[in-house]
Interface confidence: low
């Protein structure tokens, strides 16, 4: 069962992460959630500029999701349809982040309680989509560009969406084999 994200770092408002939200619940292919220029939301099989997202804590366990390239917020209509909005509407665009034990997260509209799902793609019906809420694995994106001395790597920010935010346990076991390379 999903459990609320209890990472202490999420208690602080304004905590920002750059992530790709990867899911293998898509009917046809694995995908990254992508917010496009025209406001549509879909899946990108491979990481793309449109799939780099900024996750910002609004309050404990509740986040907003912003497309870094398109400057559009991920929002959800009452019927569950997703869209990208240039304006942040707290009711439509706030998501509760629930941490699963395998490193994946589930996101639910805070207002409607509807789970976040990528729009279904064109799998034949004999390749059905799994039932239940979609599971997303937050994969690290590049942190916001900061001037760094040449030859020095900027440390990765802690993954506050993880049960091991400071990477003390070791590599995540939740990553899909598709992205193990």
């Amino acid at each position: 069962h999903p459990i609320p994200d209890s990472s202490p770092l999420l208690q602080f408002g304004g905590q920002v992460r750059q992530r790709y939200l990867y899911t293998d619940d898509a009917q046809q292919t694995e995908a990254h959630l992508e917010i496009r220029e025209d406001g549509t939301v879909g899946g990108a099989a491979d990481q793309s500029p449109e799939s780099l997202l900024q996750l910002k804590a609004l309050k404990p366990g509740v986040i907003q999701i912003l497309g870094v390239k398109t400057s559009r917020f991920l929002c959800q209509r009452p019927d569950g349809a997703l869209y990208g909005s240039l304006h942040f509407d707290p009711e439509a665009c706030s998501f509760r982040e629930l941490l699963l034990e395998d490193g994946y997260n589930v996101y639910q509209s805070e207002a409607h309680g509807l789970p976040l799902h990528l729009p279904g793609n064109k799998s034949p019906h004999r390749d059905p989509a799994p039932r239940g809420p979609a599971r997303f694995l937050p994969l690290p994106g590049l942190p916001p560009a900061l001037p760094e001395p040449p030859g020095i790597l900027a440390p990765q920010p802690p993954d506050v969406g993880s049960s091991d935010p400071l990477s003390m346990v070791g590599p995540s076991q939740g990553r899909s084999p598709s992205y193990a390379s």
């Epitope: 293998d24 046809q28 292919t29 491979d46 064109k122 799998s123 390749d127 084999p177 598709s178």
Partner: antibody, heavy 117, light 112 residues
């Protein structure tokens, strides 16, 4: 880095079968579909069939009776077999990986198959 | 099967000109999920085709914005606003809504 590497014979005798293996790296066959497409010399592209991530297949009806597509996820290999080849099956045969909203994102290098005695 | 008919067969252009390629399907190519899987590919000599446009009008990652796709129903168009030398090759439309998936016959974009 995503790669699809094809291996198979370049010359096939008429009425014989063609077997090509597409070995993939940089992704898992449990997550993506693989298509097979051919291009006859100086001609256009022809979709032959595909294998979904589940292992289910779809074939072009024109080839269904003599075409088989299978895979081994653990070896990251997809197997293409076409029987009863004739001269007009001479073509470059490609494997290609799908995307989420589109079909052919990554391609194999192509296998030029000549059907001749 | 869905027949995809491209016109023209050959399109001579001058660099910097606009180019327009038409693709007509023999039936409506709306998938049963409501989307239209109409794609455009460019193939250069000795290479495999490269994806340009998907779902009628979405540019694939890295494709210059001089490429645009439009259309609906059975009529679709690929436009190149200012042709550059690297755009020369054979363009194919493709429908991935109904099995068997089918390609158009191709349009060769060449220098006038």
């Amino acid at each position: 880095q995503v790669q699809l590497i094809q291996s198979g014979p370049g010359l096939v005798q008429p009425s014989q079968s063609l077997s090509i293996t597409c070995t993939v790296s940089g992704f898992s066959l449990t997550g993506y579909a693989i298509h097979w497409v051919r291009q006859s010399p100086g001609k256009g592209l022809e979709w032959l069939g595909m294998i979904w991530k589940s292992g289910n297949t779809d074939y072009n009806a024109a080839f269904m009776s003599r075409l088989s597509i299978t895979k081994d996820n653990s070896k990251s290999q997809v197997f293409f077999k076409m029987n009863s080849l004739q001269a007009d099956d001479t073509a470059i045969y490609y494997c290609a990986r799908n995307g989420y909203d589109y079909e052919f994102v990554y391609w194999g290098q192509g296998t030029l198959v000549t059907v001749s005695a | 099967d869905v027949l995809m008919t491209q016109t023209p067969l050959s399109l001579p252009v001058s660099l910097g000109d606009q180019a327009s390629i038409s693709c007509r399907s023999s039936q409506i190519i709306v998938h049963n999920n409501g989307d239209t899987y109409l794609e455009w590919y460019l193939q250069k000599p000795g290479q495999s085709p490269k994806l340009l446009i998907y779902k009628i009008s979405n540019r694939f990652s890295g494709v210059p914005d001089r490429f645009s796709g439009s259309g609906s129903g059975t009529d679709f168009t690929l436009k190149i606003s200012r042709v550059e030398a690297e755009d020369l090759g054979v363009y194919y439309c493709f429908q991935g809504s109904h099995v068997p998936y089918t390609f158009g016959g191709g349009t060769k974009l060449e220098i006038k």
